[in-house]
Every structure is written in C-alpha cells, then in structure tokens.
C-alpha cells in the first residue's frame, strides 16, 4: 500500500518519529508512516526532491530554499497557541525617548536574539538588505552588518571574524561567563535577552517578536531587570519611516513570519498528508494520550518533528511557498540568502565602444586594487540590444541602459534592474517629467479627457516629451485610435490643429503643421529645427503662450524656464508661471509646481540591468562600496566612476550626471523601475509598430 516517509534530522527526532509511526500504526491510521534519517534539514530537502523521502516540517527560511531551489510545496501548517494563528510578527523596538527610525539605523547599537535566528537576524538583516538600506558586498552579510550598526549583541557571533563588533554589547552572565554565547549564559540571548539589551541601555534597537515587549513589561516579568519597565516607554519602527505604539504590531512590523509547515514534492497529494496528520493530532495531541505529537520532553530536546508550541495542524489552501511565506517575509529572505560559495567570481560588464572598454578596464583594475567583489570583467557588444542578447545568453552579466532600452531589456529579454542612477536636481535633462500645460482659464477650462478637437503644440515629431509620451499615453488611454498603424493621421484627426515640427515632411498630414509659424519671415514653416519658432520645448510653450494652441506637451522645467523673468525674449519677458496649469491623468488640473504628482510620465533614470537569476543585492553592494571610493568626481583614489572626461567620451558605463548609484528597492522589475505611465506610453507607441 501507500506510505509516507518522514525525514528526521537527528537521532532524537528519529526516535520520536519511530514512536509516532508506531502510534499511528496501532491506531490504524493510513497511509502508513515510515521514517528516513537525514543529516540536516537541507539534506532532508534533497532526499525529498530525489524521491527518497516524502515530508518534513521546515521553518520559513528553509521553506523558501526548498521551494525556490527544489520545487517543494507547503501542505500543512502549524498553528500556535496565540491570537495570530499561523504566524507571528518580527518587530524592531526602540525606546520612546530616542529619535531612531528605520531610516536612521546606520550607526545605532543593535540587540539581536541570536545569529541566524528568524526575528533576531534573518528578518531584520534581510529586510534592510532588500530595501536597499544595507548594502552587502560579496555576500559577506556579517561584515556588512558589523559595519552598519555601531556595535551589536548577536549571540552566537563570537565564532565569526566580526565578533569585536557583533558581540560588543554582549555581557555574559552575572560572573561575566558565556559572553556572546548562543545560550541563556548570555543575558542578552533570546527574545527577552534582546529586549533586556535595549531596556538596560546597552542597545538602541532590539529585533524581537511582536509579543516580547508586552511579555516583559508592566510587571509581567519575574527577573528584577524588567520589573519596573513600562510598555509605554517603548515604540515599534515601521517600514515607512514612522513609529508606533508596541500594541500596533499588526500594522507596524518588519515582516509577518510564517509558521513552520510540512513540505512535500509538487507531485505529492497535500490532502493525503493532512488527513494522515489530522487523524494523528485528533488522537495524539492532548495530555494523557499514549504518544504526544507536540511534545519533545520525553526525548530530552525541543521542537522535534513539530514545534512544541503547536496547538494544531491545519491544511494549507494555496500550496505555494510564496503564498505561505507572504511577500514581507519572502522579500526579507531574498535580501538575506546569498551564498558566498555560489557567488560568481566575476561580474561581466557590457561595453559598447573603445572609450568604454578603456574606462571599464580602468574600473576593473581600480576595483581589484581595493579588493571589491565580485571582480569586473569587460565584454564588448555592438549595441544595447546586442548586450541584452548576450546577457540573456549568460555571456555577459550587466549593462546600464536608458528608459526605452530598459523596456526592451525587460519585455523582450526578461532582464531586471539591479541598481539605478540618481542625478542632482539641477540635471533635469537626464530624468524629467512630461507634462501637458494649459493656460489658467476658468471660463474655458478642459481636462486631459477633453483634448479631442483642441489645438496642440509639440516640441517636434519623435521628441520624448513632445510626441512619444503624450501620443503614446493618449493611444494607451483609448483617446487616439490609429487605423492600420497610421499614428500621424490618427493624431491629425484627434486634434483640431497642431504644430509638430518634423525633418522629413513627406506624406505628413497638413494639420500637424497648421499651427506652426516658421521664422520671422514666415519661411521654414514646420521644419524640425530652431528656424521654426514653435520648435522644441521652448517653442511648444511659445505656441501655447501666443494662443496658437490650447495645450503644450513639454518637460516639467519648460514653464519655469520661460516665465518669471527667466527668459528675456520679448514673447516671454512678462510671463508669470502662475498663469499656467498642468493637466493631470486623473482629470484634474494642478499648479505647475506640482509636476511630480501631475504628469503624463517620468522619463526614468538609467538603470543597471541583469538576468533575473543574478543576485541584485551583490551588484548594488559592489557599486555602493565602489562609489564610496570612486563616486566623487574629485576623489583621489585613481578612478572616477561617474566621469568620462579622461576617455574623450561622454556617459561611459554610467551617465556623467550621476551623483550616486541607488538600490532599486521595491522597483524590482522593468515595469516597476520605469513606472506604469512611462510603460503605458511606450506600449501605446509600440502597439503601432506594424
């Protein structure tokens, strides 16, 4: 008949498993339960994947690995005797009197329950990495954490190379024994110990469970250190940078930590496993029964086969590791799980020209001298698209791309952003908002949804803010509906008249030139250069100002560049910015200063794109450490990451305007990085490329 082979990871667990198997057999529970001995949870997962075992109970981190690497699925979950059901919450606690937030943890003193423990280490460290707050180079998480905090107590870190920093706050027992031990000898060990570390002022933040503060304050704790503590003197750090009362853990936490769950192969019937265990718990989970499923006392251990605190086992409806873990915990695990042994020794950068090869070579040498990991190798390609092909084919690893190329890299080649560029506010030509400007006119006000039949002013055919984005957006929103991919005709029929300067006017609809005025002599009408007075962003705005058009599609800076005395030309000298408004996608109008909230799209900063299986945190970790040394254009370290003047080129490897590389944070896909509006505009235009 059918049998289920449970995988045990130790002799005591094998002993308990044997007793459970025997108890189930005597009770006539089917299918029969057998026990297989593995050497560790990891080994058991491999045995299950290899069909040499069938089931094991795992914690969240192991469920993530088992699901991601071996395709196992969770089918039965543990429920603990507490109100939060199949999970608990990892929180960061601070003293109410402090000014610490999640964004200012760098340099503060930290208290952890223990090395590699879920709420004390895995979740907070994973979250800080995944959110971009903590950069890790070369998978050396311990070094990154020891550099990040201003001293810590991480019980169990004494054996590591960074014990000076990671054990600095630990104190051992009353006689000074067991300092930094992962055991009760260290007074700051475990949930209550980490909280004590905070309460006694050794640390500034404690990473504990949602219930820890309430269990150790307001007279609920027996030890003298906690008797006078009040829960109201502590607060939780929220992910959005705010703080909350310690009772608000459902809303304010680092992650919901999933309960342990039984995992099996994808082809195993989860219902069968639950029915087996459910029969078992019905008979063997209460006091006095011959076998105790949820107790390990008889074996001199804790948490054998199941956690001792389990009150019941429940079936898991959505049997995927992602659904069980939840996005918060999943994200934290992504940030944490970085295996130095599986980290490629090189990051192969795609280069497109001789000057770029030279700069990349210098970058590789400079990084190597500073022992930055992984090392850079430079690989040539013919074009951005060729880079994408080579990255997809695993011949190259990374390349910096512009918005349109990011779209292609993501959509066609499946690449994802690993890091982005950030420019100073003065560098608006590198990343800007596309806006629709109108005159402030209370009597004839119209919205973005009412543009049909209006007169439009565009910088020029094919200009991003003047044509591609606004026309793409209007197509995507269904206002402009090209027939047979004839965008020009569709636009000419949508607007009453327009000025869209163009270089090659062959077969160009006349209404797209109807508002153009040419030069002072009336010649060169609608030409795609400055001889046409309504050419370019300044010209498109002038077209609006002089009442030729009703709406101008320009950059967010255009109105400011030509009002309030910023342009002394006669047509602009007396203009005031407050006489103009923006049309917003939601149908509203807004002040021109509200461009960040009211725009058709943002032309995004460039981003470093990689394959989805590349660890983006190691890429950013490398770039972040590198920019500390080489990011400042005036650095004395022998290489300038964001300057190309030594190579007789521009924007080599990175845009010269970059002031720093930034983590992608939550923008982990090409769509996330580009923004929905920009993607919609590109899709609107690309839908017409027949």
């Amino acid at each position: 008949g059918m049998e289920v082979r449970w995988c045990a990871t130790s002799d005591p667990e094998q002993h308990k498993c044997g007793n459970m198997s025997e108890a189930f057999r005597e009770a006539g529970i089917q299918p029969s339960l057998l026990c297989v001995r593995g050497t560790s949870a990891d080994h058991c997962v491999q045995l299950i994947a290899a069909q040499e075992a069938d089931a094991i109970t795992l914690d969240g981190g192991a469920i993530y690995e088992a699901g991601k690497e071996h395709g196992l699925k969770p089918v039965v979950g543990e429920v603990y005797d507490q109100e939060v059901g199949t999970s608990y919450y990892a929180v960061a606690v601070v003293r109410r009197s402090s000014h610490v937030t999640i964004d200012t943890l760098k340099g503060v003193k930290s208290c952890h329950t223990g090395i590699n423990r879920t709420v004390g280490w895995n979740v907070p460290v994973g979250y800080l990495v995944e959110s971009g707050r903590l950069s890790v180079m070369g998978c050396d998480v311990l070094k990154a954490v020891s550099d990040y905090f201003g001293g810590s107590c991480v019980p169990g870190a004494g054996e590591t190379s960074y014990s000076e920093s990671l054990c600095r706050l630990c104190r051992g027992d009353s006689s000074g024994e067991g300092v930094c031990d992962k055991s009760p000898l260290e007074r700051y060990y475990d949930y209550s110990g980490a909280f004590r570390c905070l309460a006694e002022g050794a640390g500034d933040v404690a990473f504990v469970k949602h219930s820890t503060v309430l269990e150790n304050t307001d007279g609920k704790t027996l030890p003298s250190w906690g008797q006078a503590l009040l829960s109201q003197d502590f607060e939780l750090l929220c992910r959005d940078g705010s703080r909350a009362d310690v009772t608000e853990w459902r809303q304010c936490h680092l992650a919901r930590v999933p309960a342990h769950a039984v995992v099996v192969r994808a082809d195993t019937d989860g219902g069968l496993i639950f029915r087996l265990l459910n029969e078992g718990q019905r008979l063997f989970s209460h006091e006095g029964s011959s076998f105790q499923m949820f107790s390990s006392e008889a074996y001199g251990q804790k948490d054998l086969l199941f956690k001792d605190s389990t009150s019941e086992l429940v079936p898991i409806a959505t049997q995927t590791y992602e659904a069980w873990l939840g996005h918060e915990y999943l994200h934290a695990m992504k940030g944490l799980l970085c295996d130095p042994n599986r980290l490629p020794p090189y990051l192969r950068w795609c280069v497109l020209s001789t000057p770029e090869i030279q700069k990349c070579g210098d970058m590789a040498v400079a990084f190597r001298r500073q022992r930055l990991k992984p090392e850079i190798q430079c690989v040539s390609a013919k074009s951005p698209q060729h880079c994408m092909e080579r990255i997809q084919a695993e011949q190259v690893d990374a390349v910096t791309l512009s918005g349109e190329d990011i779209y292609t890299a993501g959509k066609t080649y499946g690449l994802v952003p690993a890091a982005g560029e950030h420019y100073a506010p003065e560098d608006s030509s590198n990343s800007y908002y596309v806006v629709a400007v109108v005159r402030r006119d209370s009597s004839h006000a119209f919205t973005l949804d009412e543009l049909r039949g209006k007169r439009s002013c565009h910088a020029g055919f094919g200009s991003p803010a003047g044509w591609d984005v606004p026309v793409g957006a209007l197509i995507q929103r269904g206002f402009i509906r090209p027939k047979d991919c004839d965008v020009l005709t569709a636009v000419s029929e949508f607007f009453n008249a327009s000025c869209v300067p163009v270089n090659n006017p062959k077969n160009y609809p006349s209404s797209l030139c109807a508002l153009c005025v040419g030069d002072e002599q009336g010649r060169n009408k609608c030409v795609g250069n400055s001889q046409e007075r309504y050419y370019g962003y300044r010209g498109a705005f002038r077209c609006l100002v002089e009442n030729a058009g009703d709406v101008a599609f320009v950059r967010h800076t255009t109105v400011f560049d030509n009002t309030n005395g910023h342009n002394s030309e006669p047509w602009a000298a007396e203009l005031r910015s407050e006489d103009y408004e923006l049309l917003c996608p939601n149908g509203a109008r807004a002040e021109v200063s509200q461009f960040a909230a009211c725009n058709l799209a943002q032309i995004p900063p460039h981003a470093v794109m990689v394959r989805p299986d590349t660890n983006i945190f190691t890429v950013y970790g490398l770039l972040d450490k590198a920019q500390d040394l080489f990011g400042d254009d005036h650095n004395k370290n022998g290489f300038k990451m964001f300057d190309s003047s030594n190579y007789h080129g521009q924007d080599l490897l990175f845009k010269d305007a970059t002031v720093r590389a930034v983590p992608v944070g939550e923008k982990t896909t090409y769509r996330g990085w580009l923004g929905l509006d920009y993607v919609a505009a590109l899709e609107g235009m690309s839908s017409q490329q027949c």
């Epitope: 100073a424 003065e426 560098d427 030509s429 400011f560 200063s593």
Partner: antibody, heavy 119, light 112 residues
Framework: QVQLQESGPGLVKPSETLSLTCTVS????????WNWIRQPPGKGLEYIGY???????YYNPSLKSRVTISRDTSKNQYSLKLSSVTAADTAVYYC?????????????WGQGTLVTVSS | DFVMTQSPLSLPVTLGQPASISCRAS???????????LQWYQQRPGQSPRLLIY???NRFSGVPDRFSGSGSGTDFTLKISRVEAEDVGVYYC?????????FGQGTKLEIK
C-alpha cells in the same frame, strides 16, 4: 508661507551622534529637495546633503561616512544624524528647501540651531 | 569640489553709495541644460542666510530691485545700487551646477 524649524539638543559629547530634526510647514517634503547646511562659529557655510522628494539622499563626500538624512512624511519632518562628532562639528546647523521655481537655490531657511560638541 | 572665491572679503561702503562684490568659480558653472546655477545669499548679523539672487541674475521674490546679479561662465558680480543700513551683513555666492553645492568665503559689507 513656507517655514522650517530646526530642533534638537544644543550640546553633544565627543564621539556621540548629533541628531537634529527639521519641521516643515507651508509645503510638503514629498516635493522638492530638503537640505542641511552648517556654519561653524565665525566661519562660512558648508553643505551637508539633501533628501529628495522620492526619499533619495545625497551627502557631501567630505561628511558621507558619518551622515544620515531621513524623513517622516507623516509628520512632514526630516532629520540629520552626524555620528562620531568632534569639536570641529560645532556649528550652527540650518535646514533649507530647494525647488525648481528658483532653480534649486535654497529659497527658504530655518533660523538655525547651534550645536556645541564638548564633554 | 568647485571652489568659489569672493573678493573683497571686507567691503566698507557709505550709505547711499553703490557696492559691488565679485565671485569667481574654479570651473565654468554652465550646466548641460544651458542654465548657470549661481546664487547669492545675504546673512544679516545673527540671522540665517536669505536668498537674494538665483540663476546669476534673477531676483528672489521680495528682494529690493537695488540688488542685481550679472556674469557668466566663471565670473560673477553682485551689485547694490544704493546701500542702505539694512544691507549690512555677509554676502555669499554659491554654485549648484555640480554637487556638492559650494559657497564662497563670504564678503562682509559694513557701513563706513
């Protein structure tokens, strides 16, 4: 009318962390760039860094290893932390706004708060 | 960093007379977008700095028209057409064409 107000301890011990908060009224810190500048007694102005409308930070390379600027949008506040301070960090600390309307000049400043580093 | 050098460092002026302060940048302040990000600030005794001029020559709102700015590239000038008693203080030029923004050493204007 845009107003900025710095707050925080006026005395910090050497090697400790200086923490200041800037409370903004009359504008939202989710638009524009929000800056910290300092001025040692009797000396000139030194730029410390900014936090952008989207929460991205930039720090003057001369101070980068010791500076953190963060924000709390719910309170319309942003903060400065400067770690491992020495007597050379004694200065009046100003918060200031930069927006496109004045081409990212610092158009509104707080009144400044004097921070003395001394044991 | 871009170095901003002001002259003179001290400027005694008679009330009602004009005053001129010069500022020189170590490199051109013309940005790729064509704008020149050069500002002038006034700091009266015991007060915080106050924006006077931005983008070389644009007066900030509320600034009297006796203040004017001019210049291009690396050389810039702040002029006060007729000095008044309330103009006493230190004047700083500043650039933000390249990060980090930098300031001149300041010019102290006093009444003779």
């Amino acid at each position: 009318q845009v107003q900025l107000q710095e707050s925080g301890p006026g005395l910090v011990k050497p090697s400790e962390t200086l923490s200041l908060t800037c409370t903004v009224s009359g504008d939202s810190i989710t638009s524009g760039y929000w800056n910290w500048i300092r001025q040692p007694p009797g000396k000139g102005l030194e730029y410390i860094g900014y936090i952008s409308d989207s929460g991205i930070t930039y720090y003057n390379p001369s101070l980068k290893s010791r500076v953190t600027i963060s924000r709390d949008t719910s309170k319309n506040q942003y903060s400065l932390k400067l770690s491992s301070v020495t007597a050379a960090d004694t200065a009046v600390y100003y918060c200031a706004r930069r927006t496109l309307a004045t081409y990212y000049a610092m158009d509104y400043w707080g009144q400044g708060t004097l921070v003395t580093v001394s044991s | 960093d871009f170095v901003m050098t002001q002259s003179p460092l001290s400027l005694p002026v008679t009330l009602g007379q004009p005053a001129s302060i010069s500022c020189r940048a170590s490199q051109s302040l013309v940005q790729s977008d064509g704008n020149t990000y050069l500002q002038w600030y006034q700091q009266r005794p015991g007060q915080s700095p106050r924006l006077l001029i931005y983008r070389v020559s644009n007066r900030f709102s509320g600034v009297p028209d006796r203040f004017s700015g001019s210049g291009s590239g690396t050389d810039f000038t702040l002029k006060i057409s007729r000095v008044e008693a309330e103009d006493v203080g230190v004047y700083y030029c500043s650039q933000s064409t390249q990060v980090p923004p930098t300031f001149g050493q300041g010019t102290k204007l006093e009444i003779k």
